[in-house]
Interface confidence: medium
């Protein structure tokens, strides 16, 4: 059974992941980002179901495409460092989903823009955090 300390750690990791995802979203979903129009043409795979920590496998598998799109956004008005950011997210995701069981991610039929993708995972984090508090 999960202890209160492990629950607290999970909550903190989710909050960290949530902040990272929100920071990316705020950085790109900015109508003064001249790269936004191009970034919205890239498609991301969405999870068919995302209700448990193991479903973070679906996020992990999309981190490389996410980094590639973020590399497009580099400009003097956009100070995210994609490689560092994605690396941090990857570490958190690996810890949260665990590596004991292998989970095959199931994707929805419809792909999504980077904004929809980030919003989906932000909602996921918020939902799990609310069940822990």
């Amino acid at each position: 059974a999960p202890t209160s300390s492990s629950t607290k750690k999970t909550q903190l990791q989710l909050e960290h992941l949530l902040l990272d995802l929100q920071m990316i979203l705020n950085g790109i979903n900015n109508y003064k980002n001249p790269k936004l129009t191009r970034m919205l043409t890239f498609k991301f795979y969405m999870p068919k179901k995302a209700t448990e920590l193991k479903h973070l496998q679906c996020l992990e598998e999309e981190l490389k495409p996410l980094e590639e799109v973020l590399n497009l956004a580099q400009s003097k008005n956009f100070h995210l460092r994609p490689r560092d950011l994605i690396s941090n997210i990857n570490v958190i995701v690996l810890e949260l989903k665990g590596s004991e069981t292998t989970f095959m991610c199931e994707y929805a039929d419809e792909t999504a823009t980077i904004v929809e993708f980030l919003n989906r995972w932000i909602t996921f984090c918020q939902s799990i955090i609310s069940t822990l508090t």
Partner: antibody, heavy 122, light 108 residues
Framework: EVQLLESGAEVKKPGASVKVSCKAS????????MHWVRQAPGQGLEWMGI????????SYAQKFQGRVTMTRDTSTSTVYMELSSLRSEDTAVYYC???????????????WGQGTMVTVSS | EIVLTQSPGTLSLSPGERATLSCRAS???????LAWYQQKPGQAPRLLIY???NRATGIPDRFSGSGSGADFTLTISRLEPEDFAVYYC?????????FGGGTKVEIK
């Protein structure tokens, strides 16, 4: 006096394109972002996109991606909005609106053009 | 996208009365990037309030804005004949920029 003067009314057939102009005067053209907003008859306001007159960079609302092109001509202090593949639902008044620069990175629209009526009808 | 819901749809009041217009956002509007515009028939919108509570240049002090987060209010303390128009709220801190559906203030 700060002013935005838009081009005259247009009547277009479905499938055609329309290009609306907006000439700025009374201020430094390249110092303010310009937006386009449209309003269908009897309806509310809908944001279409933004152009930075200084560098010419643009961002468009997803709804108009692939159909709208915003450009500018710094020599005449004019911005343009071209909408292609017109359909009847595009019948609206099209406004250019200047984004102010009084309070940081994001600002409200302090100056509006008088609007250009675009009618799409077969 | 942030959806802005304005209420009521129509407000029937007499000159001299107080008008209270509401704008509710589907999610928090960052840094109070919320504006109010007035539009009269056949005219372009005119900026009244920006940053939720700041009056634009030349706007009479009977117009005031308040609120934060997801709930905002435009108040006209004493309606003048020229105030009867449609009022729109707008959020301009998140792409796409969005407007509310409008509130029509009409003479009772």
């Amino acid at each position: 006096e700060v002013q935005l003067l838009e081009s005259g009314a247009e009547v277009k057939k479905p499938g055609a394109s329309v290009k609306v102009s907006c000439k700025a005067s009374g201020y430094t053209f390249t110092s303010y972002y310009m937006h386009w907003v449209r309003q269908a008859p009897g309806q509310g306001l809908e944001w279409m996109g933004i152009i930075n007159p200084s560098g010419g960079s643009t961002s468009y609302a997803q709804k108009f991606q692939g159909r709208v092109t915003m450009t500018r001509d710094t020599s005449t202090s004019t911005v343009y909005m071209e909408l292609s593949s017109l359909r009847s639902e595009d019948t609206a008044v099209y406004y250019c609106a200047r984004e102010g620069n009084s309070s940081g990175y994001y600002n409200a629209f302090d100056i509006w053009g008088q609007g250009t009526m675009v009618t799409v009808s077969s | 996208e942030i959806v802005l819901t304005q209420s009521p749809g129509t407000l029937s009041l007499s000159p001299g009365e107080r008008a209270t217009l509401s704008c509710r956002a589907s999610q928090s509007v960052s840094s109070s990037y919320l504006a109010w515009y007035q539009q009269k028939p056949g005219q372009a919108p005119r900026l009244l309030i920006y940053g939720a509570s700041n009056r634009a240049t030349g706007i009479p002090d009977r117009f005031s804005g308040s609120g934060s987060g997801a709930d905002f209010t435009l108040t006209i303390s004493r309606l003048e004949p020229e105030d009867f128009a449609v009022y729109y709220c707008q959020q301009y801190g998140s792409s796409p920029l969005t407007f509310g559906g409008g509130t029509k203030v009409e003479i009772k």
